[in-house]
């Protein structure tokens, strides 16, 4: 069995250089501890953005350092990520483990796009 | 190392040059002349752990982030335990993309 | 995996299979090399993307059950064994590997 990973193609991010988008795992087994990690594709270079472990029915916490936040619902995870400039523009890959009860199973989503455009700066005012 | 059959064993992987507790870590082995067997692995901050049914009750997978060190205890080992053990890195992407040189466990009496 | 043993010429192509005895995601395969003495080395994962610094003469392709890696010329260096692993579920397994041999 496989797990299968959805999530959005394209997403924008906002003014303030915040995106958000839907993961959504299709769960071969019953897990109580899930695992997501956002990972950012660039080129060959793949790097961790990211990651939260939690128990089903419980609310994600990622490290107070974090640049993500998240909330969870079934087998629906809903991930922010701040603080993004121009040059954050990438593919955001979502990755999902079921880490328990075994066995493990691992999903990967086929990224999503996201595009950020720094806000022009405000012309000085006389 | 050469240690008797019922004896016991560590074996200890020291990693380098990523994020250590951002992977999964492997423990493979290879009998001498046969093909990779997987072990054990040992999940990000070591609360998760899965070994294969040959050696589950008998090996006990550990790590210290700190200092990046992946452990393998090993006890009442027998002769088929004999073989080279490797560590491995679980990529970001699931596949052991970088291994150690591997270490020559040798049980017998 | 097959077959056991390939015997090859340098420049000649190489073909090797590795079936799973059930389907599984594309997505989790992966190919390694071992050379005589060595630890393995990751060649392809996600059955057809190759690893960081792996020469363009390999390639993996397949799906469900039946995957291929193909080494389009061979290099003496190549000469090695091969194992198959699926990674996307517990127990990690492979293949029992295939030798490429020099005829």
């Known amino acids: 069995k496989a797990m299968h990973v959805a999530q959005p193609a394209v997403v924008l991010a906002n003014s303030r250089g915040t995106a958000s988008f839907v993961c959504e795992y299709a769960s071969p087994g019953k897990a109580t501890e899930v695992r997501v990690t956002v990972l950012r594709q660039a080129d060959s270079q793949v790097t961790e953005v990211c990651a939260a472990t939690y128990m089903m029915g419980n609310e994600l916490t990622f490290l107070d350092d974090s640049i993500c936040t998240g909330t969870s619902s079934g087998n629906q995870v809903n991930l922010t990520i701040q603080g993004l400039r121009a040059m954050d523009t990438g593919l955001y890959i979502c990755k999902v483990e079921l880490m328990y009860p075994p066995p493990y199973y691992m999903g990967i989503g086929n990224g999503t796009q996201i595009y950020v455009i720094d806000p022009e700066p405000c012309p000085d005012s006389d | 190392g050469v240690v008797q059959p019922g004896r016991s064993l560590r074996l200890s992987c020291v990693a380098s040059?990523?994020?250590?507790?951002?992977?999964?870590m492997h423990w493979v082995r290879q009998a001498p002349g046969k093909g990779l067997e997987w072990v054990a692995v040992i999940w990000y901050d070591g609360r998760n752990k899965y070994y294969a049914d040959s050696v589950k009750g008998r090996f006990t997978i550990s790590r210290d982030n700190s200092k990046n060190t992946l452990f393998l205890q090993m006890n009442s080992l027998r002769a088929e335990d004999t073989a080279v053990y490797y560590c491995?890195?679980?990529?970001?992407?699931?596949?052991?993309?970088?291994w150690g040189q591997g270490t020559l466990v040798t049980v017998s009496s | 995996q097959s077959p056991g043993t390939l015997s090859l010429s340098p420049g000649e192509r190489a073909t090797l299979s590795c079936r799973a005895s059930q389907s599984i995601s594309s997505s989790f395969l992966a190919w390694y090399q071992q050379r005589p003495g060595q630890a393995p080395r990751l060649l392809i994962y996600?059955?057809?993307s190759r690893a960081t610094g792996i020469p363009d003469r390999f390639s993996g392709s397949g799906s469900g059950t039946d995957f291929t890696l193909t080494i389009s010329r061979l290099e003496p260096e190549d000469f090695a064994v091969y194992y198959c692993q699926q990674y996307g579920t517990s127990p990690w397994t492979f293949g029992q590997g295939t030798k490429v041999e020099i005829k």
């Open positions: 996600g059955a057809s």
């Open positions: 491995a890195r679980g990529g970001h992407f699931g596949p052991f993309d970088y």
């Open positions: 040059g990523f994020t250590f507790s951002s992977h999964g």
